[in-house]
Amino acid sequence: SITGISPITESLASLSTYNDQSITFALEDESYEIYVEDLKKDKKKDKVLLSYYESQHPSSESGDGVDGKMLMVTLSPTKDFWLQANNKEHSVELHKCEKPLPDQAFFVLHNRSFNCVSFECKTDPGVFIGVKDNHLALIKVDYSENLGSENILFKLSEILEHHHHHH
């Protein structure tokens, strides 16, 4: 369960892949599309509002019931729209929704290396946001093997301005 309904903190950041491609969002036919692309030099990076929530481990996962807390994030590139996992289609989509947000909008945050993170589906442990064919997709990861695989690593570059104004 998510502890409380308000985030611990929020930050405004640009999101890029391990290979420094940008994650961009485009409004097309009244819905948003998500792209993974090389940005032209002068083009500004798209911003995403990350909201951080505290969550208790599901009891099945915590070996002796003491692994209390994980960080979960929601990602919102524009007002009222959030990234969501579509587990049936193995896709990542932008949906307009109202709070309280559905579980599909929450991702467990994994700090991977100095500036890299991964996003694991709250609704499907072991499944991460990843890059496939220049799009974001859901990728099943074998914990024992591939947690460091580059296609699920993302770089967050915090934008130091007042985050509430990103919309």
Epitope: I8, E54, D67, L109, H110, N111, R112, L160
Partner: antibody, heavy 122, light 107 residues
Framework: EVQLVESGGGLVQPGGSLRLSCAAS????????MTWVRQAPGKGLEWVST????????YYADSVQGRFTISRGHSKNTLYLQMNSLRAEDTAVYYC???????????????WGQGTMVTVSS | DIQMTQSPSSVSASVGDRVTITCRAS??????LAWYQQKPGKAPQLLIY???RLQSGVPSRFWGSGSGTDFTLTISSLQPEDFATYYC?????????FGPGTKVDIK
């Protein structure tokens, strides 16, 4: 109950080596990045090193880079700090610490060991 | 590296007093700041994490606030067991850094 128990401290001559251990219990060790923090006598706290839950990422303070090596043994739920080329300024109590959040280092250190004293002197 | 400064470096206070300690980061750290209490010969104890979240088991007279670069720890009514040294620490990124500490002693 979470427990962290350090051992391996002692008196060592400058240029010598020591290996510190921290035995962890009461939580799923492999899910947590683990950290060493030290405190010189009468001084403040200084972060020394952190290792990711999987063990494949390590981070060091500039003051110990190249001399200290952090590692972890998952089968024994133990954190290690191999300290080589020790200097007088490494004299301190060394604590191991567990972060608030599994899989992330953003929170804080919610559990600390009792500490083990390392004295570097001739 | 992010530098952490604390003020005051020491404060003399009486039981029942309200005590405020401030911590400043040299650059923005969002809300990734923790406060610890340490007594002589003991390990530090976590009081507040994520700038304002009270660690389980810590009395509610301790509270934290702030984000970005400026943070505050307040003890609303000082108790005899609160005389100790208090440290802030940024957990935004490596190298993690601690403030120099604030010693709270008996007036």
């Amino acid at each position: 109950e979470v427990q962290l128990v350090e051992s391996g401290g002692g008196l060592v001559q400058p240029g010598g080596s020591l290996r510190l251990s921290c035995a962890a219990s009461g939580f799923t060790f492999s899910n947590y990045a683990m950290t060493w923090v030290r405190q010189a006598p009468g001084k403040g706290l200084e972060w020394v090193s952190t290792i990711s839950g999987s063990g494949d990422n390590t981070y060091y303070a500039d003051s110990v880079q190249g001399r200290f090596t952090i590692s972890r043994g998952h089968s024994k739920n133990t954190l290690y700090l191999q300290m080589n080329s020790l200097r007088a300024e490494d004299t301190a109590v060394y604590y191991c610490a567990k972060p608030t959040y599994s899989r992330s280092w953003y929170g804080a250190f919610d559990f600390w060991g009792q500490g083990t004293m390392v004295t570097v002197s001739s | 590296d992010i530098q952490m400064t604390q003020s005051p470096s020491s404060v003399s206070a009486s039981v029942g007093d309200r005590v405020t300690i401030t911590c400043r980061a040299s650059q923005g750290i969002s809300s990734w700041l923790a406060w610890y209490q340490q007594k002589p010969g003991k390990a530090p104890q976590l009081l507040i994490y994520a700038a304002s979240r009270l660690q389980s088991g810590v009395p509610s007279r301790f509270w934290g606030s702030g984000s970005g670069t400026d943070f505050t720890l307040t003890i609303s009514s000082l108790q005899p067991e609160d005389f100790a040294t208090y440290y802030c620490q940024q957990a935004n990124n490596f190298p993690f850094t601690f403030g120099p500490g604030t010693k709270v002693d008996i007036k």
